[in-house]
């Protein structure tokens, strides 16, 4: 398994990840957003709701 060198993003990237943590993938020369639960997108800019349908009376 290849080792990936990571560190925190620089202050230059403040605000890059809207709803998540910014990680600097050193060997890949790029910033990566680790999104909070419920968010997706390159910059964690999209909110998605997982809707759980209640069980129908027939099923009960």
């Amino acid at each position: 398994v290849a080792q990936v060198s990571i560190t925190k993003c620089s202050s230059d990237m403040n605000g890059y990840c809207l709803h998540g943590q910014c990680i600097y993938l050193v060997d890949m020369s790029q910033n990566y957003c680790r999104c909070e639960v419920g968010y997706t997108g390159v910059r964690c800019e999209h909110f998605f709701l997982t809707v759980h349908q209640p069980l129908s009376k027939e099923y009960v």
Partner: antibody
Framework: QDQLVQSGAEVKKPGASVKVSCKAS????????IQWVRQAPGQGLEWMGR????????KYREKFEGRVTITADTSTNTAYMELSSLRSEDTAVYYC?????????WGQGTLVTVSS | DIQMTQSPSSLSASVGDRVTITCKAS??????IAWYQQKPGQAPRLLIQ???TLQPGVPSRFSGSGSGTDYTFTISSLQPEDIATYYC????????FGGGTKVEIK
């Protein structure tokens, strides 16, 4: 293949304004920051400012504050840099640079000549 | 604004020589420094980022080191194709380039 294609060379008179465009292809500018850097003939590289196209937020180098405006049109995947009150010292090659999802990917540069 | 003082501004060395360029930041930049090579009429080419990480395709004779405010870029054995101007860039807090170092062959 990712590309940043800039508008063509411009010749402007002192006091005029110039607007340079930077069209991205192969990626979405909303995923990045777009920086602008210039280089006068025979001189070094100078960072001017940047935009976060997703939120429209800008940061400028102090010396350009009030004279430079960086904008982005996410519908056309294009960033712009407008410099006003041009003087001869603004004669330079202007580069747009993508950062964020990839460290510093440069456009080909746009030569702006300021001459009376 | 963070200032980057790059030295020397120019140097002349022989093929095979070890060449060293330094950049001093006006404050701690936490290793967020990159080094570029620029040849006349071309856009800058990224060689190294995050102090010492070589970009794909960049020869191993190029290296970088440092921490805090003091950083060094080294060409271990100068080649004719290395004739260019080299710039440091801090990207810890916004961005600032060093003044550049023009490398020539003796």
């Amino acid at each position: 293949q990712d590309q940043l294609v800039q508008s063509g060379a411009e010749v402007k008179k002192p006091g005029a304004s110039v607007k340079v465009s930077c069209k991205a292809s192969g990626f979405n500018i909303k995923d990045t920051y777009i920086q602008w850097v210039r280089q006068a003939p025979g001189q070094g590289l100078e960072w001017m400012g940047r935009i976060d196209p997703l939120r429209g937020r800008t940061k400028y180098r102090e010396k350009f504050e009030g004279r430079v405006t960086i904008t982005a049109d996410t519908s056309t995947n294009t960033a712009y840099m407008e410099l006003s009150s041009l003087r001869s010292e603004d004669t330079a090659v202007y580069y747009c640079v993508r950062s964020g999802t990839l460290f510093d990917f440069w456009g080909q540069g746009t030569l702006v000549t300021v001459s009376s | 604004d963070i200032q980057m003082t790059q030295s020397p501004s120019s140097l002349s060395a022989s093929v095979g020589d070890r060449v060293t360029i330094t950049c001093k930041a006006s404050q701690d930049i936490h290793k967020y420094i990159a080094w570029y090579q620029q040849k006349p009429g071309q856009a800058p080419r990224l060689l190294i980022q995050y102090t010492s990480t070589l970009q794909p395709g960049v020869p191993s004779r190029f290296s970088g080191s440092g921490s805090g405010t003091d950083y060094t870029f080294t060409i271990s054995s100068l080649q004719p194709e290395d004739i260019a101007t080299y710039y440091c860039l801090q990207y810890d807090n916004l961005r600032t380039f060093g003044g550049g170092t023009k490398v020539e062959i003796k």
